[in-house]
């Protein structure tokens, strides 16, 4: 999906009012310095591409993030504020349902959510120069 035509300000508002705290709660008990940010993004469409990938695509050591509350809210926000997103995701979801995993919090998942927090921070500050 091409995130270029999303309403970025509405997605930012959604993040600030309904998503960010759930990421913090997921990470509770973890030091903010525990993980280094290794995933970056250069602009808002790129950030959303990376956020979608980290949130919904199972990875080695962390297969379950898609069933977390913050992921559900992300899915809902993208569907509302990115034209055509819901249509493109319907087929992808049918495939995902066949491999729905039980929610398990692993260190790899914590690291992945830490990366997500960094991507969201970057998304919310699009005018900052890339480090």
């Amino acid at each position: 999906y091409d995130f270029t035509n999303c309403d970025f300000e509405k997605i930012k508002a959604a993040y600030l009012s309904t998503i960010s705290k759930d990421l913090i709660t997921y990470m509770s008990g973890t030091k903010s310095t525990e993980f280094n940010n290794t995933v970056s993004c250069s602009n808002r469409p790129h950030c959303l591409t990376e956020i979608q990938s980290l949130t919904f695509n199972p990875t080695a050591g962390c297969a379950s993030l898609a069933k977390e509350m913050f992921a559900m809210k992300t899915k809902a926000a993208l569907a509302i504020w990115c034209p055509g997103y819901s249509e493109t995701q319907i087929n992808a979801t049918q495939a995902m349902k066949k491999r729905r995993k039980r929610k398990v919090t692993t260190n790899k998942c914590l690291e992945q959510v830490s990366q997500l927090q960094g991507l969201w921070r970057r998304f919310n500050r699009p005018l900052l120069k890339q480090q």
Epitope: I19, T25, M72, A76, A77, T93
Partner: antibody, heavy 117, light 108 residues
């Protein structure tokens, strides 16, 4: 303007079935997570069920296995199929637009379901 | 699912400040929403994301959430504010929406 209109409520005997419908207008229905919330007479609000644009569903434990939520995005319509109805299912059933999965920003006017012999 | 606890009733004199509490385990780690419901009407969202007001909701409505308690505050309460108020959050395991039992606000 944004509107949700429920229909299909009525009197049904215990063990019976009923299908509620909700016609949505004024917004891109196919993009939103939609849900049903009920309110027994003189009681509080109880979330019943919700459904994503892609058909992914969630249910309250009290209705799991008896109620089925569905949607037809081409008709901008939300449904609630209620089977094996019990007296305790008697309530006003509200169709609701659930913003960002976690709260309700638009409510219908409600339709009354009475389960009684 | 988590349980949200509200006082059944709260009374306030016109022009005074009404505070309605909503208690739940580690509630401060989740977002809380508040709805106003008048007799025979559907609920109306008055606070979202702990403390934000939807457009059209008067400034006298405000919200806070920390620890195990969220609070809806109505400053300079008016007769038209008499209604039932429901807090709402969600369960992080089941992902279900959860409502408090409701509080009847009486403006004396």
């Amino acid at each position: 303007q944004v509107q949700l209109v429920e229909s299909g409520g009525g009197l049904v005997q215990p063990g019976g079935s009923l299908r509620l419908s909700c016609a949505a207008s004024g917004f891109t229905f196919s993009s939103y997570y939609m849900s049903w919330v009920r309110q027994a007479p003189g009681k509080g609000l109880e979330w019943v069920s919700g459904i994503f644009f892609d058909g992914e569903t969630y249910y309250a434990d009290s209705v799991k296995g008896r109620f089925t939520i569905s949607r037809d995005n081409s008709k901008n319509t939300l449904y609630l199929q209620m089977n094996s109805l019990r007296a305790e299912d008697t309530a006003v059933y509200y169709c609701a637009r659930q913003q960002y999965f976690d709260h309700i920003d638009i409510w219908g006017q409600g339709t009354l379901v009475t389960v009684s012999s | 699912d988590i349980e949200l606890t509200q006082p059944p009733s709260v009374s306030v004199a016109p022009g005074q400040t009404a505070r309605i509490s909503c208690g739940g385990d580690s509630l401060g780690g989740k977002y809380v929403y508040w709805y106003q419901q008048k007799p025979g009407q559907a609920p109306v969202l008055v606070i979202y994301g702990d403390s934000k007001r939807p457009s059209g909701i008067p400034e006298r409505f405000s919200g806070s959430n920390s620890g195990n308690t969220a609070t809806l505050t109505i400053s300079g309460t008016q007769a038209e504010d008499e209604a039932d108020y429901y807090c709402q959050s969600y369960d992080l395991k089941s992902l279900n929406v959860v409502f408090g039992g409701g509080t009847k606000l009486t403006v004396l």
